[in-house]
């Protein structure tokens, strides 16, 4: 037999808005209080097993207590009611969950999408949390006929039961509800047929076309409804490396098509593209992305022919010369295919003319001391690259006309190189450079830029600490004028070694130190100073600064018959090093001098 | 390496005609004159005839014109002489000879690489 409880709590079921004030009574049974020797005044109130402090209980009367509580911000309470049971032994009388929250917010954005396939899907905004168990009901009906309700799972959308009927415009709304309250959103009436989200489009192909080579096909199959919806395109393209899509212009897609030509494409480059779709008229949803594709542009004939040079061997006696013709294979960007040779034509001055077909980056020639013009082009298999015309000069003409105020720098991790343009009109610059080494020939790489450059930085791999010498040729229709060098580094650093001193000549009170310049390959960058410094074992340490373009130096007042000990640095602009330390000692007599 | 291989020397009477036949083998490069040259003892080396092997152009010494013609089978790597009319003076060593220099003066013996070992030719009255 269930034991009846000795009073009751109301309300039982307590919802409090949060922040408001709340009272509840405890009301003890009359055979309660006779069993027990109590009254009002004998109940302890509690929340969460802390009693509630007196001030906030009032003994209404004989069976009543009431306890008020302000402000109430805890989302749940055990709220219990307890007597002091003969005065002293505490029992609980009854126990109530206090839950507090808000009523509901009126919801608003509330929005319908029909993803093409499923039923209709509509989102809400609930507004702030009510910290409350809230039902959320989506309604729905037409004017002459409700649909069934949605009943919300999660309490910001609803999947309708029913297939939406399109061509016939609907009302739906959203009513939120809850202890606190009841409200219900604006209504939204709009025919589901505008509220579409179609399927991708499917079976994206690209397809290139041999008559040019800056155009690609693609064909798709759109689904909208299964032909039941006219849709519009929306194209992204971008190239196989790049990260950001390029887009059609949306004006060019409006109308309902399966294919479209994109056009102002590279030649000979893949492109990747993706595609969605929306009903014609703008409304509804678009599509999600379809599977990317791509393809690739057709070949082109090289849009330029490539950078041209030429080196010449000693010549074999007086007779002829070997020329070494060289020239850099084409960025993809210009070669526009893959080339297949090279065709190099050598025009003797007499029109003596000989073809050669190259497939490599060079052709080593022998010609007579007479002038020649030699012409390059680069041939895919499309056809053939402008060509690119160099004029090979007799050995017995000298070159005029350098470049001027020629500098070179380092700044943004790049070498750069300047120059002022010689007064006479420039085809072209030629920029050699390699690397200074004791150890190693010079082994040059070279660029070519245009007539109207006179500033650019070396586009190889270059080494930091390491001295370049850059040589810059100004050619001209006629052949190369001449080649002015500099030395340069890309980042110094500070030597490798410093300078091995060595006395060259010592006497009473001076002594003349020599030293060897350091190989260029421990300078690490330009030799700016020398510093000597020399001291005796109890003297204090002097120090004299030499410029770097000495390699000897006379130390004056010294002692005689002493020993010094001597050692040089070399400093270049991030720094310097210590040479070995050398000593020596001053003669006690001068030379002829007697005791 | 490079080998150039004369043929078809001998003995004919004044007025007769020969036939030489060069082969070139092992050549990488891409000669541009093939020629003919012969050499009486005692005497320097001359230029007879000589063959462009990208056009086909030739020219020959003045002393043969018009009887001997140079030509080219290219498929095969050979050049022919083939000498008409030969007279007391044409005898002497016939060398074939290769040249990789881009030239008019197809004949000067200076611009010429690669030579064979010789064939003799022989006129007698």
């Known amino acids: 037999q269930l034991l009846e409880p000795c009073g009751y709590i109301y309300p039982e079921f307590p919802v409090v808005q949060r922040g408001s004030n709340f009272t509840a009574i405890c009301v003890l049974k009359e055979a309660c209080l006779q069993h027990y020797y109590v009254n009002a005044s004998y109940i302890v109130w509690k929340t969460n097993h802390a009693a509630v402090p007196r001030e906030q209980v009032t003994v209404i009367n004989r069976t009543t207590s009431s306890v008020t509580f302000t402000d109430v911000v805890l989302p749940s309470v055990q709220l219990t009611c307890n007597i002091l049971s003969f005065g002293q032994i505490e029992q609980n009388v009854y126990g109530v969950t206090m839950l507090s929250g808000f009523p509901p917010d009126k919801p608003t954005n509330l929005t319908c999408i029909v993803n093409e396939g499923k039923n209709m899907l509509c989102q809400w905004d609930p507004g702030r949390e009510t910290y409350l168990e809230t039902n959320y009901t989506l309604k729905s009906e037409w004017a002459t006929e409700k649909f069934p309700d949605c009943q919300s799972k999660h309490g910001t959308s609803c999947m309708v039961s029913y297939m939406p009927t399109y061509y016939v415009n609907i009302e739906v709304w959203v009513e939120a509800e809850n202890a606190l309250g009841k409200v219900s959103s604006e209504s939204i009436n709009f025919d589901p047929v505008d509220k579409v989200k179609p399927t991708p489009p499917y079976n994206l192909s690209v397809t290139n076309s041999e008559e040019l080579s800056s155009i690609l096909k693609l064909s798709w199959v759109s689904s909208g409804l299964g032909g039941l919806l006219d849709l519009k395109s929306d194209i992204q393209y971008r190239t196989k490396d790049a990260s950001t899509w390029i887009q059609v212009p949306l004006e060019d897609t409006m109308s309902p098509r399966t294919s479209f030509t994109v056009q102002d494409l590279k030649p000979f480059t893949e492109y990747v593209f993706r595609i969605r779709s929306i009903k014609d008229s703008g409304k509804g949803y678009w599509s999600d992305w379809s599977e990317e594709a791509s393809g690739t542009t057709y070949e082109d004939r090289p849009s330029r022919p490539p950078s041209f040079w030429y080196k010449t061997n000693p010549s074999h006696g007086q007779e002829y010369r070997s020329v070494r013709l060289i020239w850099k294979a084409l960025p993809l960007s210009e070669a526009n295919g893959k080339i297949l040779d090279y065709e190099v034509i050598l025009t003797q001055s007499k029109s003596v003319s000989q073809t050669y077909t190259v497939t490599g980056t060079e052709l080593t020639v022998n010609l007579t001391n007479d002038r020649y013009v030699a012409s390059l082009a680069a041939r895919n298999k499309v056809g053939k690259s402008a060509a690119a015309v160099l004029t090979i000069p007799s050995p017995h003409v000298t070159a005029a006309y350098s470049v001027v105020n020629l500098k070179a720098f380092p700044k943004d991790n790049l070498l750069w190189v300047e120059w002022t343009p010689p007064p006479k009109p420039v085809s072209k610059y030629i920029l050699e450079w390699c690397v200074l080494s004791e150890n190693a020939p010079c082994v040059e790489d070279w660029q070519q830029e245009d007539a109207t450059v006179n500033r650019t930085h070396l586009r190889g791999r270059l080494l930091e600490s390491k001295c370049y010498q850059i040589t810059v040729t100004p050619v001209f229709a006629t052949g190369p004028g001449g080649s002015e060098s500099l030395k340069a580094y890309l980042k110094q650093a500070a030597p490798a070694r410093g300078p091995t001193v060595r006395t060259k000549k010592v006497g009473k009170n001076e002594a003349v130190l020599a030293w060897d310049q350091i190989p260029v390959d421990d300078q690490n960058g330009f030799i700016r100073n020398y510093s000597i410094s020399y001291r005796t074992s109890v003297g204090k340490e002097m120090v004299v600064h030499v410029d770097s373009s000495h390699t000897e130096y006379t130390l004056s007042s010294l002692s005689s018959d002493t020993l010094y000990m001597v050692r040089m640095a070399a400093y270049t602009d991030e720094g310097g090093k210590d040479g070995p330390e050398f000593t020596f000692t001053t003669p006690k007599f001068a030379q002829g001098e007697i005791e | 390496q490079v080998q150039l291989q004369e043929s078809g020397g001998g003995s004919v009477q004044a007025g007769g005609s020969l036939r030489l036949s060069c082969v070139i083998s092992?050549?990488?490069?891409?000669?541009?004159?093939m020629g003919w040259f012969r050499q009486v003892v005692g005497k320097e080396r001359e230029g007879v005839a000589a063959?462009?092997?990208?056009?086909?152009?030739?020219i020959y010494a003045d002393s043969v014109k018009g009887r001997f013609t140079i030509s080219q089978d290219s498929s095969k790597d050979t050049v022919y002489l083939e000498m008409n009319g030969l007279k007391l003076e044409d005898t002497g060593m016939y060398y074939c000879?290769?040249?990789?220099?881009?030239?008019?003066?197809?004949?000067?013996?200076?611009?010429?690489?690669?030579w064979g070992q010789g064939t003799q030719v022989t006129v007698s009255s």
């Open positions: 092992g050549f990488t490069y891409r000669q541009t004159f």
């Open positions: 063959i462009s092997t990208g056009g086909g152009s030739t």
């Open positions: 000879a290769a040249s990789t220099v881009i030239t008019s003066e197809s004949i000067n013996r200076n611009l010429y690489q690669y």
